[in-house]
């Protein structure tokens, strides 16, 4: 008895697809060894058609896939566009050769069934409408017309021209004639359900002179499209239900035993399990819409269905589309923090992973909003202007080649709590969702800037100091000037050896920044922060206002301005004469060409100044003891 198990007999019809699941014993070796699907030849040789090593035969090119699910100890072979030539004996197995562990599978592909010549075949999807055409001779033009459904030997009337309608077809069936036609009548049956399938007979007249037509109605259940996604990646369900339901409410539901639980609909309903990671987007006026889910979890695997009904809930006899989602736990997307906590007045540094093969892709950060169907306006991006309300407190630091970028948000308020998405214009699977939780601060912030009312005078020297606690002793301290395209780190100057952290004086850890001489363009937001290599930590921000020296105002001696800094036993001093280039940053329209739900932040009309590279600073002051 083979330890591999699967379906012995698989049958389908031409043009269709099959999805064959093979089960293997749960061992480490089995999980990682080669999986294969081969065709048994008359000579006993089994020719590989597809394997998990990446091999794909010519006859399967473009129509087959093999996916391993180690966490379930299964692998799935999908074969599309079946033809009768695919009928035969196959093996699904494990091992480096096709003689290892295997299971025999018989596949039979038949032709689409044919019916007697006088039978018209109607094939419709669930929820759709069928129009059955019934021809008759002139002699029966004034006779009773009817449509009945065969049940065994009997034929039960569905509708007739005396206005009788079978209760199960009430409000769904109508009998009519078109224009001046005298030899044909029609029966429409709408909101088709599976039990409507079968053989129908339409008749004009009675007795031996009656005209009869046979109609075979096939009502197709939606065949689920199989979707294979990695853990933590994202999936988009594209739903096209047709023009006839364009004005009805739309929904996506997840099958749960015999019910289908709505995850999201256009009437504002949303499953709390998908809070912060789902968007429903209307695509056009013809009823097309898509649902995007990010941060896929193991428990998201299952059967999904989209549909339309005025109630926004699944209803029998209304059109649907179906999917089966598999979530592969062997994910290329790294595990990152799903919840980040901050305090009012403080800051957070959020690390966003992206596909390392796409280091040149544009990076973005958006805020998921619950209103209506969910939306995610971009707040910051590598080429996107920072959204209004975030000036001076939000920046994106790209770290090319590292497979991650960092978004820093400071001056936190409780209103900043919520869900945020990291995304790029590249691999759409790499969308991560972060929940930011901001609590009221109970203590002073770790980083404090003095003076807090920072007004610098043109032509003079201006110094601001950032006080940090001993816990940041070993980390790199920096000042940067915030602009619409990031926060550009200013040149630093570290004088002398640092004192041992054992004797760190909590009150005297200072990093200072000096502007000398102050220019009008020095006005703006400055950040003081700490980092370790590419890992960014706490930041604090201060707005430096610049004003003209008023007549009679005292000239500030640079020495006095730095007096406090000079007394500091541990200090790093920086000075900047940063100049900025005029630069208009616009969001790449390709990013969401097909995803309008993520709002474009780069189409703001105003022109924003984006700083260039910081120039080198001259005349640093300050000392280290």
């Amino acid at each position: 008895q083979s330890p591999i198990f699967g379906p012995q007999d698989v049958s389908s019809i031409e043009g269709n697809s099959v999805s064959i699941t093979c089960y293997y014993p749960d061992t480490s070796v089995n999980r990682h060894t080669r999986k294969y699907w081969c065709r048994q030849g008359a000579n006993g040789y089994c020719a590989t058609l597809i394997s998990s090593n990446g091999y794909l035969s010519k006859e399967y090119s473009g129509r087959a896939s093999l996916i391993n699910f180690p966490e379930n100890s299964t692998f799935v072979i999908n074969i599309a566009h079946l033809t009768q030539e695919d009928t035969g004996s196959y093996k699904c197995g494990l091992g480096t050769t096709n003689r290892g562990l295997f299971f025999d599978v018989s596949l039979e592909v038949s032709q689409v069934p044919e019916f007697p010549n006088d039978t018209h075949v109607y094939t419709k999807d669930i929820g759709r409408t069928v129009t059955i055409e019934c021809r008759f001779k002139e002699g029966n033009a004034h006779s009773k017309k009817s449509l009945c459904k065969k049940r065994g030997e009997a034929c039960e009337v569905v509708i007739d021209s005396t206005e009788y309608v079978d209760p199960s077809y009430k409000d769904r069936a109508i009998l009519f004639m078109k224009g001046t036609s005298r030899d044909i009548f029609y029966v429409n049956i709408s909101h088709l359900i599976p039990s409507d399938a079968g053989l129908y007979v339409c008749q004009a007249g009675e007795g031996p002179s009656a005209d009869k037509n046979n109609a075979d109605l096939q009502v197709l259940e939606p065949e689920p499209e199989l979707l294979y996604k990695d853990l933590r990646s994202s999936v988009t369900f594209e739903c096209d239900l047709g023009r006839e339901v364009a004005n009805d409410a739309k929904y996506l539901c997840r099958k749960n035993k015999e019910t289908c639980d709505v995850i999201i609909n256009t009437l504002g309903k949303r499953d709390p399990a998908f809070e912060g990671r789902i968007l429903l987007t209307p695509r056009d006026d013809n009823g097309r819409f898509s649902v995007l889910i990010t941060g896929l979890r193991k428990e998201d695997a299952g059967h999904y269905q989209c549909g339309a009904h005025s109630s926004g809930l699944p209803q029998e006899g209304w059109p649907v589309q179906a999917w089966q989602l598999f979530v592969n736990e062997e994910s290329t997307i790294p595990n990152s923090r799903s919840v980040v906590k901050g305090v009012t007045g403080g800051s957070v540094a959020i690390v966003c992973p992206y596909n390392p093969k796409e280091s040149s892709s544009l990076k973005y950060w958006c805020h998921w909003e619950a209103d209506e169907n969910g939306r995610c306006p971009v707040l910051v991006g590598t080429q996107a202007l920072v959204q209004e309300g975030y000036e001076g407190r939000l920046a994106l630091f790209d770290q090319p080649g590292s497979g991650a970028y960092t978004v820093i948000l400071n001056q936190l308020t409780t209103q900043d709590s919520g869900f945020y998405w990291c995304l790029t214009d590249g691999d759409s699977r790499w969308r991560t969702t972060i929940e930011l939780q901001v609590a009221e601060a109970t203590k002073k912030p770790d980083l404090e800037v003095t003076p807090q009312n920072a007004t610098a005078v043109i032509g003079e020297t201006f110094t601001i100091s950032c006080h940090y606690p001993c816990k940041f002793y070993s980390q790199e301290k920096y000042w940067c000037k915030w602009s619409n395209d990031g926060c550009h780190i200013l040149p630093s100057h570290d004088e002398g050896a640092r004192q041992s952290s054992v004797s760190c004086d909590q009150s005297s850890q200072i990093v200072s920044m000096t502007l000398n001489p102050v220019k009008k363009e020095d006005e703006g937001w400055y950040w003081c922060g700490v980092k370790e290599g590419q890992v960014y930590g706490e930041t604090t921000a201060i707005y430096v206002a610049v004003e003209e020296r008023t007549r009679g105002s005292p000239h500030i001696n640079p020495t006095d301005a730095n007096a406090r800094a000079k007394d500091a036993p541990e200090e790093e001093a920086m000075e900047s004469s940063v100049r900025e280039d005029e630069n208009k940053a616009n969001l790449d329209p390709r990013l969401f060409a097909d995803e309008r739900e993520i709002q474009n932040a780069g189409d703001q009309a105003q022109e924003n100044r984006a700083s260039g590279n910081a120039g080198s600073a001259g005349g640093q002051s300050g000392s280290s003891k």
């Epitope: 007999d9 019809i13 259940e221 099958k255 015999e258 059967h303 179906a322 089966q324």
Partner: nanobody, 126 residues
């Protein structure tokens, strides 16, 4: 709610045949799996065979000991899953249950099924 009802059980001589049927009523979806299991007195419920379908594709599974003797099928019009049992042996005796699920799971496991019928007794005498 989905209801499953088994029928067709009875007493049969070894080598004889029986046709069991599992009728489903209530809400069903496009992809579905139905499995046949049997339980001999004092023993665990064991897998006999299963059928699953999705659109116009059908997948049939059998336990090794019944392969070639039992055939599982699906009657769309009647919404039933018959189990044709030929060349019956005394060890085939037991209560036969059918189970149903809308999920794609390992059909051999009882835990894969969300709904169960009450069972029908099959006795094979020697």
């Amino acid at each position: 709610e989905v209801q499953l009802v088994e029928s067709g059980g009875g007493l049969v001589q070894a080598g004889g045949s029986l046709r069991l049927s599992c009728a489903a009523s209530g809400r069903t979806f496009g992809s579905y799996s139905m499995g046949w299991f049997r339980q001999a007195p004092g023993k665990e419920r064991e897998f006999v065979g299963a059928i699953s379908w999705s659109g116009s594709s059908t997948y049939k599974y059998y336990e090794d000991s019944v392969k070639g003797r039992f055939t599982i099928s699906r009657d769309n019009a009647k919404n039933t899953v018959p189990l044709q049992m030929n060349s019956l042996k005394p060890e085939d005796t037991g209560v036969y249950f059918c189970g149903g699920t809308m999920e794609r799971r390992d059909p051999r496991r009882t835990s894969a099924y969300d709904y169960w019928g009450q069972g029908t007794l099959v006795t094979v005498s020697s």
